[in-house]
């Protein structure tokens, strides 16, 4: 009869499974675990050895010992090139006696399961059946390397035949190639290259822009110093055995330079002292990018010209430039650098700042009490405001009220070509604290000093004007 | 790839002495490394090896007088117990020929180095 | 443990002959069967594995056979850089266990 299964393929060693015979026998059960039988060899008497040894009990007659169960010897090196096909097997002659015997099949310690080619075959006779167990590989590849074994389990016992090597031989197989770099100008440099048989040896020969580097093939690994190049190259390397000849993937060893400059500089947002700007990153010449440097020259024929430097890191490619005059206009370039240096600047753009806030307070507030309207009247003096801060829009009154632990900060905006202001009277025996502040399209600026007026109970009369006094009149 | 042993010299019987077995180019997670000696005039005598999962095996006359062990990724070291004269010789490290991570294999030996001399004696 | 034993242990043969060398393993190891070359000085260098397997770099006129027990290495047309000792080495195994062994060794001279 034939079977043909899904063969499996070699677990790891087997506790007493000491072959000495080249044949594998089975070892019997024991409370302790395997017990090796002290027997002859069938092959070489008188020549003690332990094995996993099946030492069938009786025959049907109930009188005579069997022979040990052992795998027939076979070749055990197979040596074959890649794509080839192979068959292998095993064989053994079991008595009669022995009933449901299974024959797997295994591979450096893993049971080879699925659908590999195996097939077993059976012949009995009349107190024996030759058991030949086949495996077969189409088009064998170096996974297909290996140790495999045939185990055949008989009566819960466990014969295990000697390993047959498998030596699928090929073109080298790289193990290590050559890697892509960029170096700096004049240095010298290594590169890796290692592949592997069998057959070995492998032999490296190196390649630079399509021409042999050494005349002589290096033994694998081979390291190629390179001691220094003034342009780019390609190298690649040849690994040589005596089934022929593999070439690793090319690589481009580039030479470091300074970077490209950048460009395609914008601007994303202004305001009156800072200036939000973005740009692209140019070729990094081989290198990455250190850092970079946004330079700042105001456009005014007055300014002395003087360029304003502002280091940044590389990434993100944006910076916001700060400490700006406002209402002004500048030229912004951006320059990045490497290991080797510094690209030239980008482009210049054109970039302006907004108006800003007034940098100084109103002058000389003043403020009194007219009782007979119930309010409190307020003049002050127009900031002298630079051009950078805009055109004044207004003014902004706080006026805070204080009495018997209460407080209230209300605010009025008033008109540019007011100095005067009139706001009612919001708590009697009360303190009044006004402040004023000057307004312009960029902002509220600083508000003047305090000044604090008491608003007395109904009745009560005092013409007497709180006041701030101008720069130089204290 | 090469191998290189160092450590021989001139030791008193019973002096303990660790050989080493230098590889490069040879990752031991992949390949056997084995031991062989030769006495002066003689021939070459099978100590142990050490497969690439780390498992010793070594011949009988060997057991218990020397120890294989791997050290780093790029040493292996053979230690002789108890010397006595009759281990002067010249030791070699060899490699087995077929990578793969297993215990067993078929390692007879591809790569050796040029050996290292052990001199025992009073 | 195997036990290799080669014969002989010396011969001699003119430039231009035939050696043969024999090697017998004290139980079968199948086809596990090296032929090292050693030159004074230096260490052994492998010709033939698998039994009758040519190394790299080996000349042809280096022949392996045998399996089993019984091995023989056939060296033809003889050179003087044949002259050296010559090893041959079981390398089988198990899956329990490795069985390395080293034959006493046949020393060619070439005159």
């Known amino acids: 009869r034939e079977e043909a299964k899904p063969y499996p393929l070699f677990p790891g060693p087997l506790p007493g499974s000491l072959q000495t015979d080249h044949t594998s026998l089975l070892s019997l059960p024991h409370t302790s675990g395997y017990q090796p039988a002290l027997m002859f060899s069938p092959t070489q008497p008188g020549r003690p050895y332990t094995g996993n040894v099946a030492i069938p009990r009786v025959t049907s007659a109930g009188s005579k010992l069997l022979p040990p169960l052992a795998f027939k010897h076979t070749v055990g090196h197979i040596i074959l090139s890649e794509h080839k096909d192979v068959k292998f097997n095993c064989s053994i002659s079991v008595p009669n006696i022995y009933q449901d015997t299974t024959i797997s099949w295994w591979k450096d310690g893993k049971e080879l399961l699925g659908a590999h080619h195996a097939i077993t075959q059976f012949y009995p006779d009349d107190e024996v059946t030759a058991i030949i167990a086949s495996f077969s590989i189409t088009s064998v590849q170096r996974s297909d390397n290996g140790s495999y074994i045939c185990k055949m389990k008989i009566n819960n016992e466990e014969i295990v035949s000697d390993p047959i090597y498998i030596e699928v031989q090929g073109l080298p197989h790289f193990t290590k190639q050559p890697e892509s770099m960029n170096v700096t100008r004049n240095t010298a440099f290594n590169l890796t290259c290692q592949a592997v048989g069998p057959p070995e040896p492998v032999n490296i020969f190196w390649v630079q822009n399509s021409s042999r580097v050494n005349e002589q093939p290096e033994k694998s690994p081979s390291v190629l110093t390179v001691p220094g190049l003034t342009e780019m190259a390609v190298f690649s390397c040849e690994a040589h055995n005596d089934k022929g000849l593999t070439v690793s993937k090319g690589v481009q060893i580039n030479i470091k330079a300074i970077p490209s400059p950048p460009t395609e500089v914008s601007i994303h947002n202004s305001t009156a002292h800072s200036i939000l700007i973005s740009w692209v990153p140019g070729f990094d010449g081989y290198s990455p990018f250190r850092n970079c440097s946004v330079q700042v020259k105001e456009v005014d024929p007055l300014s002395n010209g003087s360029v304003m430097i502002f280091n940044t890191s590389a990434s993100p490619h944006m910076y916001q430039i700060k400490q700006l005059q406002a209402l002004a206009n500048y030229s912004i370039g951006v320059s990045c650098m490497n290991e080797i240096g510094w690209s030239a600047v980008s482009p210049w753009i054109l970039a302006s700042t907004t108006e800003g806030a007034p940098s100084v307070a109103p002058l000389n507030v003043t403020v009194f009490l007219n009782e007979s309207r119930d309010n409190v009247d307020i003049r002050w003096m127009k900031p002298l405001t630079k051009r950078q801060a805009g055109e004044l829009v207004g003014y902004r009154i706080s006026h805070v009220w204080q009495s018997a632990g209460i407080s209230k900060e209300l605010l009025e905006e008033v008109g540019q070509n007011n100095s005067r202001a009139q706001i009612s009277v919001q708590v009697h025996n009360a303190t009044c604290t006004v402040r004023i502040a000057a307004v312009t399209k960029g902002g509220v600026g600083p508000f003047s000093d305090p000044v604090k007026i008491f608003i007395p109970a109904h009745g009560w009369v005092d013409h007497a004007p709180s006041s701030t006094p101008a720069p130089g009149n204290a | 790839q090469s191998l290189e042993e160092s450590g021989g010299r001139l030791v008193t019987p019973g002096t303990p002495l660790t050989l080493t077995c230098t590889v490069s180019?040879?990752?031991?997670?992949?390949?056997?490394l084995g031991w062989v000696r030769q006495a002066p005039g003689k021939g070459l005598e099978y100590i142990g090896i050490?497969?690439?999962?780390?498992?010793t095996y070594y011949a009988t006359w060997a057991k218990g007088r020397f120890t294989i062990s791997k050290t780093s990724s790029t040493t292996v070291d053979l230690k002789i117990t108890g010397p006595t004269t009759e281990d002067t010789a010249t030791y070699f490290c060899a490699r087995g020929a077929y990578a793969g991570y297993v215990a067993f294999g078929p390692y007879y030996f591809h790569i050796w180095g040029p050996g290292t001399l052990v001199t025992i004696s009073l | 443990d195997i036990v290799m034993t080669q014969t002989p242990a010396s011969v001699e043969a003119a430039v231009g002959g035939t050696v043969t060398i024999k090697c017998q393993a004290s139980q079968s190891i199948s086809n596990f069967l090296a032929w090292y070359q050693q030159k004074p000085g230096q260490p052994p260098k492998v010709l033939i594995y698998?039994?009758?397997h040519l190394a790299s770099g080996v000349p042809s006129r280096f022949k392996g056979s045998g399996s089993g027990t019984q091995f023989t290495l056939t060296i033809s047309d003889l050179e003087c850089a044949d002259a050296a000792t010559y090893y041959c080495?079981?390398?089988?195994?198990?899956?329990?266990?490795?069985?390395?062994?080293f034959g006493g060794g046949t020393e060619v001279v070439v005159r």
């Open positions: 698998a039994a009758s």
């Open positions: 180019g040879i990752d031991l997670s992949s390949y056997a």
């Open positions: 080495q079981s390398y089988f195994y198990s899956s329990t266990s490795i069985y390395n062994a």
């Open positions: 050490i497969s690439s999962t780390g498992t």
